[in-house]
Every structure is written in C-alpha cells, then in structure tokens.
C-alpha cells in the first residue's frame, strides 16, 4: 500500500500494487519539448485546487459509468513560460473551443490561449499560450472534464458488491502513484504540494467522505434535489497521491479520542452491524497516540477515517485522513477470523497510521526515495502494533516477515540497491517498479538496524527534529540522516565509527548484504557480499566494493558481549569472537543487523550441542537465525547442506513458533525442489518424527483441540504443528482434519473449526477429499460474509489433488463474477503452490498471459508475484527452456512490473537446476538416516 502489504496468505507480507504502463516510445519523441518529458517543468507551481466531482453510480445510455468534474487550479509562475503543462490521464474535455479557461489573479494580465492538446504518452494536458506568464504572478486555470468511473481500481473508480441479491455500487479512489491525474487535471508529482478544496455531488441517500471533514452538512443540489452537495474543509498543503474521496452507503462506528480527533471505521452496513469494525476502532486510538508520542508531533488532522473496500488492489493506502483498506486488512470477526487475521489488521493499521506523519506530513520529494517512506512504515508498524497488543511480542515478527524474506531476494545477483538515482525513475512503469520487497522489507530492516545501533531514544530524537523541520514539505533520505546526525552530535554516550550518512550509504547505495564469517579459534572476523548462487556474476559495480560498516552484537555462552563495529574492511580480529574449546559464540543478537553469520565448524557444533541440551540459553530469535542462516549458507556452498539439516535436529524439543517457522520456511525450498522426487518420502517421514512432540504438546495444551493457547506466538506455533503434521501425513492429524470437515459438511450452519485452524484444516480435508468436499467449500465461499473466511476458502480450494477440479478453478480466475479481479493472481498462485496444480497453473499463465496482462494490468505488483509463484518449482532444463520461450513469446505484450521478476525467475531456475544436481543424493541420504 499501497502495505499496503498485500498479505493474502497468512503472515505473508508482499508489496502493494499500483498501475503500470510499459512504453519505450517516449525515446523517439523530441525531448526538447517539455511536454514530451515525463517530469514536470518547475516553471509553474500549484498553490491551491478547487475540485468538484460528480460520480454517476448508474450506467449512462452507452452502458458506461462516468463521473464529471470541474477543477480550478491556482498557479504561481516561477519563471516566464508560454506553455502550461499539467497531468491528465483518460479524461475528456470539451471539443468546442479550448479545453480550459485561464484567468489572472489580482492584477496579473493573462495571455490568450493559442491551442490546447492532450499528450497521451506523457499523460499531459498542454495549454499553448500566445504570450508568457510572468514570474511572481498568480493565475487560475479552470477546466471541466468527464472520465469513466471504471472498475479498474485506479484513480476515481467504482467498486461493486452484493447485499443479498442487490448489486451495490460505490465510487472510491486510489491515487498512488500516478492516478490522481485520472481523476482531475493536476500537477501529479509528490513535491508539487498544494491545498485542496474538494466538493462531491452525490445521490442524497449516500455518504460522501474525503480527506477532511465536511464544511457543515450536505445541501441539496439546487437543480436536482435527489442529489446532495458536500463541500469539505480545505486540506493542509499536501501531495496529490494522498487525496481520497468516496461516495457510498457505508456506515461507521465512531469514537472521539482524548485529543478531539474523530476516529471512524467505515464498511458495508452488514459488516458494521455485525461488529466487524470494532477491533479496528479499538486499536486505532492507541496507535495514533503511540505515533503522536513517537514522533513528538500531534496528529495533524481533525479526523481519522478508515474504510474497508470490497475492491482494492493494494493491501491498504495511507491517504491523509481517509485511509483505504482491503476488507481483510481492516475488518475482524471474532467468530470467523483467525489470530493471524487479527495480527494483519493491527499491523496494517499501524503501517498506514505511521504514514500520516512520515510520508504525508513530510513527504519524499520523488519516487526514487520510496524505500524510505515504505521501509520506515514497514518497520514502525511493528512498534505501533506492539503498543496496541503488548502481550503478542509482535516486534519479533519483523525477522521472519521482513528481514529473512527480503534477504532471499537481496542475495541474488539481480537485486538492486535501495536508492535509485532520481533521473532513472521517470515513467509510471519505472515508478511502479519502486514498489517491491526491497523498498518495503529491506527498507524496514536497515531502518530497524539504524534505530538499534543509535538506540531508540536517539533515533526518536532525530526523527522528531526531522518532522518538525520539514512539516508540510518534501525531503530526500539525506535530510533524515542529517537530523539523526545532529542528535548523535548532541550527546556523548553513543559513539559511531563514522557519520550516519557514511554508515547508511553502505547499506542503501549498494545492493545485497554481507555474510560475516567468524573463526572462533583466532577471533578473526571477515565480511563478504552474500550471494545465494556463489557462481553468479555481479555486473553492478559498487563505490564501496561490496563492503559494509557493520554493527555487531554477540553472546558468548549465554552472556551478552560488548558491541563491536566491523569497519568496511574485508577482515579484522577481536578477542570477543575467540572461544575456548567448549565455548560457543553467537553473533547478531535478535538479528537486529541486516546480515547473515557463518562460523567455523567447531562453533556450529557447539551451538547445535547447546540447542539439543538446553535451548533456552539462546534467545528464541537466534534459534531461528541459526536455521535461516545455515540453510542460506548451504545454498551458497559456504557450509555443507548436512550442517544446515543438523541444525533442525533440536526441533523435537522446540515449542516456540519462530524456530519452527524458520525450519519450515527453509525446508519449503526442499519441498519445492523434491516433492516430485524420491527424496520426498523420507523427508516427510523425518518431519513427521520431528513435529509429533509438538503436535502432542498442543493436543494436550488445548484439551484435544477444544481451546486455544493464550498468546499469539503459541497460537501460531499450534497452527504450524497441525499444518506440518497434516501435510506430512501424521495419521492423527489427517483424521482430525477429516472429522472436523465432515462435521461441518453435515451441519453447514455451525462450523466447528476454530478460525485459527481453518486454513490448514480446510486445505487438508480438501486434499484428502474429492468433488463433494470441493463443491461444499466452493458453496461456502459463495456465501461467505467475511472476506477473511473467503480468503481461507479460496486458498484451500487450491489444495485439491484432482487435476480436473484445479483446471476448472483456474478457469474461474478469469471470471470476475466468480473470483474478484483483486484475488485472481493470488488464487492462481495458490494453485501453483500445490504440486499437482503447479504445471496446470504454469500452462494457464502461458496461455492467458495477454488476457491477464490486459484485464489485470491495473495491479502491477501482483504480476511479479504471479511470475514468482508459477515458476517457484522450476528446477529442470526443460522448465528453463519453457521459461525462456515464455519470455520470447510475450515480448510484444510485455511484463510490466513483472519484468524484474521474470529475470529473477530465470536466474532462480538456473540456480535450482544446479542445486538439485548437487544436493539430491546427500539430502536423500540424510533424511533416510534421520527418519
């Protein structure tokens, strides 16, 4: 969100989506003409807009839904110009005379208009004048326009939903990144801040919302009292991408915070009536308070609206004062929502509310710095959510959710640095490419590292100073470093080895991260750019030679050691890292640093011994780290794969979520590579053996699955226990899934399966079952009132083992009446994640790429997910050839923001082929020996 995170799968963060346009035609245009350049000239700056919009929520005579609009933009001339260039996309203007009217403000004389034109490629309305506008003078440009209120989830769009048998239509917006121009002509760049006076003309039985509260109550439209006019208060100075307006018959639950800020949660009337907005309402006040305190700045607006939309491409979008969400990111039903649904709601709310200051009040000047905006929010979302749910240990979840998730991408030679030069980001497609996991999750990881080595207090001090200095303005990431440096310079207890900028430049200007290797015999410590494929060729040069300034914390035999900085040298020595023969040392406590760690073999063995004798001496995050790092190191040929597998032996005594999650996500690669081969049998047998104690632990703890554990991490661990036991064929688990699902089928009104367990029980029951189970679940999906329940069913339907059912299901994804557009790509990916469905999904994507790309092109990030999803198992020469052919066949259509994902898929497939060749035999033998 854009996160905004498009977390369809349970605790699977992904980046948000935004529209994409792929074009190279611009290169051939005359670049000396400013209207052929994608960046706006700075000759004119907007001061204020008056925008009136009238959406028609019934189709016109041509069967089209439209909106009409009127805009008056006040311009300040900075330097003489005889042309006005303003963004406009897919808007129609009068064909009679000029498209706009121009007036001088005060004593400004206005030249006559020569002609007006629309430049489609660069998305401009261009007004050619017979004379020049003069610096220091103000002008007003008025335009009236008409656009389609399409169901394309971009700009001013329409969303439809069913209430009983009645189709309801609402109008809503998604401006980020470059679609405000699709709603009204505007200077659609984040640094072109202005004030906005929004007026909505809407049917009088509907409610109008915008960023600001209404000025008084709505008034009837004089010409037609069936319509109302709602005028909103003037916004503060703000960017176009944060505008929002919505016309719907939604209802709300409200509260007024102690500081007088009105908090409202809006949703479909049914959802509000059933109390699904209450959890969001309960956490919003505390989260807003947390951030006001964290930023040392009051919430900058008089109200905070949050609304759950039936059709929404991103996970959520941080529009100032009117935050939009997918339903599953805002609504929570205690009866049918799982603990992970609840976690998603609180973290996405925290992410979006974090932006109300960082991003909205202070905004990055251009999209190349998106990583700071999104990375920051993706980090502090955990802090805000932790404040709202203090018993959940949410802050730990950044490690699996962001740090290790993005390291898998950042350890590829095709990765890219966080920072992209501004001049390399121009077109909407290039802007769209900024919204990836590097921006969100690596951004979050390095900002967390920065906050940790500065200490949170010092970080907050610099942050508050930055926000106060740049309120209502625009910045670059260097401005934040500067204010953090001032905070560092003003005290003496925290000493850094270099400036904040110098340290952070190493992490932002070069891609990837280091692996730190320790030799505990000598205390030698070294760093090296970590690549999952040790033979891959890094073509991107780095000014810092792929060396970093690395903050290192460590534990020796359970005792915390002094902090150490590894300078940007390849090798150093320190006795902190030297151990006696029976001792062990462990680096990167709680994985606060964005790097991985390798040890000499003796130290690895000592860590394993410790884990198998008394694992509680090692912090839970580091028990997970040992698994994550060693599996990655094995992939990179830095340790034997058997060492990584040995690091899972302690799990039969492990009850905590994070180490198990580390093992399951690391071994998921093994499943992808081997679930079509003879390795899979012994592997399942080993996992059954390891998980059985955990399964029995929770069976007892929950009184035979009738209760839930108290805290979040234990609930997640219980879900893992059942999911792992069932998917690896533990008979007690398969019986449990079958029994519970049968019970539900015989009494559909009463679902006996606890919401936490539904995803895994549904999936396993459908996998064991046939058409009856599938059709029953499909029927339940059709009548699911809550999107969380629908998500679980939609994903579980992909678990079938029947080829014909999966093929039929794939067909459904192209019919928006059966599968919503916003859910199409995630549904295809769910089918692809099933070993039986994978080749079907790949064939389907190849056959339908053109249609998918044309119909679903509004949601760009989902294309990278789609390509990633259907190619994840590729590990043979034949599959590599297919992928290369797919690339060749679709060059004309293009891949939009999936372009990079396609390159990554080719690279990953080659690495997979190699990995399987090298590891199949040794892995097979290890599993046979240990099962």
């Amino acid at each position: 969100y854009a996160q905004e995170k498009n977390k369809n799968a349970e605790h699977v963060p992904q980046a948000p989506t935004s529209p994409t346009i792929t074009t190279t035609a611009a290169i051939t245009l005359d670049q000396s003409k400013p209207w052929n350049r994608y960046r706006l000239p700075t000759t004119l700056l907007p001061d204020s807009y008056n925008v009136t919009l009238r959406p028609y929520l019934t189709p016109n005579a041509d069967g089209l839904y439209i909106f009409k609009g009127k805009s008056i933009v006040r311009l300040l001339c900075q330097e003489p110009t005889d042309v006005i260039i303003i963004h406009s996309k897919k808007l129609n203007y009068t064909t009679q005379g000029h498209m706009v009217v121009l007036r001088g403000v005060g004593d400004s004389q206005v030249p006559e208009i020569d002609r007006t034109e629309l430049v489609e490629l660069t998305e401009y309305l261009v007004v050619h004048l017979k004379g020049s506008l003069q610096p220091g003078h103000m002008y007003e440009m008025e335009s009236e326009f008409q656009g389609e209120l399409a169901d394309d989830l971009a700009g001013f769009y329409r969303s439809e939903y069913m209430e009983g048998n009645v189709k309801k239509v609402l109008a809503t917006t998604q401006m980020q990144s470059t679609d405000a121009r699709k709603s009204f002509p505007c200077f659609d760049e984040p640094a072109m801040k202005a004030t906005f006076n929004i007026t909505l003309i809407h049917p009088n039985n509907l409610t109008a919302l915008s960023n600001m509260p209404p000025k008084g109550s709505s008034t009837p439209l004089a010409e037609d009292p069936n319509w109302s006019v709602t005028e909103f208060e003037t916004t503060p100075v703000m960017s176009t991408y944060l505008l929002a307006y919505i016309v719907s018959e939604f209802q709300s639950v409200n509260e007024t915070a102690q500081n007088g800020v009105l908090i409202r949660i809006w949703a479909r009337p049914n959802a509000i009536a059933e109390g699904h907005g209450m959890y969001a309402l309960n956490v919003t006040g505390p989260i807003l308070n947390f951030f006001a305190n964290h930023y040392n700045t009051s919430y900058p607006l008089p109200k905070s609206d949050q609304i759950a939309l039936p059709d929404f491409n991103a996970g959520a979008m941080e529009n100032w004062g009117l935050v939009t969400y997918r339903e599953n990111a805002l609504l929570f039903d205690p009866q049918s929502s799982s603990i992970s649904n609840k976690e998603r709601v609180v973290t996405v709310i925290a992410h979006e509310l974090a932006h109300q200051w960082f991003g909205n009040l202070v905004t990055l000047a251009w999209w190349n710095d998106l990583w700071l905006n999104e990375g920051f929010a993706s980090y502090v979302e955990y802090l805000g959510a932790d404040h709202a749910e203090p018993t959940w240990n949410l802050k730990d979840l950044i490690v699996p959710g962001d740090v290790y998730r993005v390291m898998a991408v950042d350890a590829l030679a095709s990765s890219h640095p966080l920072t992209t030069p501004a001049e390399e980001v121009n077109t909407p497609a290039q802007i769209s490419e900024m919204f990836d996991s590097i921006s969100y999750s690596k951004g979050a990881s390095v900002i967390r590292m920065l906050s940790n080595f500065l200490t949170e207090d010092l970080f907050k001090e610099g942050l508050a100073s930055y926000l106060h200095a740049f309120a209502y303005q625009n910045t670059t990431y260097l401005d934040l470093w500067e204010h953090l440096q001032k905070a560092v310079d003003a005290q003496t207890s925290i000493r850094l080895p270099d400036t904040v900028r110098a340290i952070m430049d190493r992490w932002t200007l070069q891609m990837g991260f280091p692996v730190i290797t320790v030799d505990t015999k000598t205390g030698n410590i070294s760093q090296k750019h970590f690549l999952l494929d040790s033979e891959s060729n890094v073509t991107r040069s780095s000014a810092f030679d792929y060396l970093w300034i690395v903050p290192i914390s460590s534990i020796k035999n359970g005792v915390m050691q002094d902090h150490y900085w590894l300078r940007d040298v390849s090798q150093a020595q320190n006795d902190l890292f030297k151990t006696a023969s029976d001792d062990w040392v462990l680096l990167n406590v709680n994985v606060t640093g964005y790097f991985q760690v390798n040890y000499d073999e003796d130290n690895w063995r000592m860590i394993q011994h410790q884990l198998q004798t008394n694992l509680s001496v090692i912090p839970v995050i580091n028990r997970a780290q040992v698994i994550y790092d060693s599996f990655n190191l094995a992939t990179a040929h830095m340790v034997p794969v058997t060492l990584a597998l040995d690091n899972t032996l302690f799990l039969n005594g492990e009850k905590e979520y994070m180490p198990w999650q580390a093992a399951l996500s690391s071994l998921s690669y093994f499943s992808l590579m081997f679930d079509r081969s003879e390795v899979y049998g012994p592997m399942k047998k080993y996992l059954r053996k390891q998980v059985e104690p955990l399964f029995q632990h929770f069976e007892t703890l929950t009184k035979n699955w009738t209760e839930r554990p108290e805290n979040l991490m234990d609930q997640y661990s219980e879900i893992n226990a059942i999911s792992t036991a069932c998917s690896n064929g533990l008979p007690q688990c398969e019986n449990l899934a079958k029994t519970l699902f049968d019970q539900w089928m015989s009494d559909p009104e009463n679902n006996p399966i606890h919401p936490n367990l539904r995803s895994t029980i549904y999936c396993n029951a459908i996998a064991q079952g046939g058409q009856d189970q599938w059709d029953f679940a499909w029927g339940q999906l059709q009548q699911a009132q809550l999107v969380n329940e629908a998500d679980k069913l939609r994903s579980a339907l992909a678990c079938s083992n029947e080829v014909w059912l999966l093929n039929r299901y794939l067909g459904y994804t192209l019919n928006p009446d059966l599968i919503r557009k916003q859910d199409a790509t995630s549904t295809i990916n769910s089918i692809a994640s099933n070993v039986i469905g994978q080749p079907l999904a790949w064939d389907f994507v190849q056959s339908n790429w053109k249609k998918l790309f044309q119909d679903y092109g509004g949601g760009s990030f989902s294309f990278s997910n789609l390509i990633q999803g259907v190619t994840r198992r590729f590990s043979s020469e034949f599959e590599l050839q297919q992928l290369e052919q797919f690339k060749k066949n679709n060059m004309d259509v293009g891949f939009g923001s999936g372009t990079r994902a396609l390159e990554q898929a080719l690279e990953k497939t080659k690495a997979n082929i190699k990995w399987v060749k090298e590891n199949k035999e040794v892995v097979l033998n290890w599993f046979i020996e240990h099962s």
Epitope: T52, R54, K68, G69, K70, Y93, T94, T95, Q96, G97, H98, M99, V101, E142, E144, F145, Q146, I201, A222, E223
Partner: nanobody, 124 residues
Framework: QVQLQESGGGLVQAGGSLRLSCAAS????????MGWFRQAPGKEREFVAA????????NYADSVKGRFFISRDDAKNTVYLQMNSLKPEDTAVYYC?????????????????WGQGTQVTVSS
C-alpha cells in the same frame, strides 16, 4: 452546425411555474456550454442562465437567482429552464443559445448559435 428549438412557453399567473425546453440537433451538443437569454418588448436581450458542458457550472442573472434553475440532459440533447415564482417582469421572449466552448458565459456575443425564441407571459 447546431440547430436549437425552444418550447414550453405560454401564459402563466404571477407566482406560477413554467419549464422551458431547448432541443438541439447536431453532434457536438454534449460539448457545448448552453445559455438562456430573454428580450422584453423595447428592451435589449439579456442574460438569464448558463450551464457548462458537464453541467457542473451554472450561472444566473441576479434577478432570477433562487427562482430559475438551468439543467441539461445530454442523452436527450436538451437543455431546460425551470422557472418558479414567476413575476410580471419575467415576461419576455426566451432564447436558447449554444456556445462554441464548453464553458458557461454570461456574455451574449460569446454565443454563436441561437433558437427562434419562445414567448413567456406572466400576468398579475
């Protein structure tokens, strides 16, 4: 080329209402701003009301504000003038006009196309 034909005029008592219609032929109607003007015997033609091509901008002469309402229906290529609380001084020939621009204007000379007019008489 736009042809305009007014209808709906007639005799009405003071305080009554009338609705004038102006049917337009020609493909560009939906892109034109439209206006109503009137001319009382022995007086100059004067602006009454105007509406922009989208219908989002309406302008009225001070003398009719709050009593007259202009609207348009692009599907029917028609512009309307709803006249309420009529007064004897509203008696005049009412003309419909189309502008070669999408933007509403009060100025007579900015309208290029005119209808024949329809008589409105308000008796006291």
């Amino acid at each position: 080329q736009v042809q305009l034909q007014e209808s709906g005029g007639g005799l009405v008592q003071a305080g009554g209402s009338l609705r004038l219609s102006c049917a337009a032929s020609g493909r560009t109607f939906s892109s034109n701003a439209m206006g109503w003007f009137r001319q009382a015997p022995g007086k100059e033609r004067e602006f009454v009301a105007a509406i922009s091509w989208t219908g989002l901008t309406t302008n009225y002469a001070d003398s009719v504000k709050g009593r007259f309402f202009i609207s348009r229906d692009d599907a029917k290529n028609t512009v309307y003038l709803q006249m309420n609380s009529l007064k004897p001084e509203d008696t005049a020939v009412y003309y419909c006009a189309a502008r070669q621009s999408g933007y509403a204007s009060k100025f007579l000379d900015e309208y290029g196309y005119w209808g024949q007019g329809t008589q409105v008489t308000v008796s006291s």
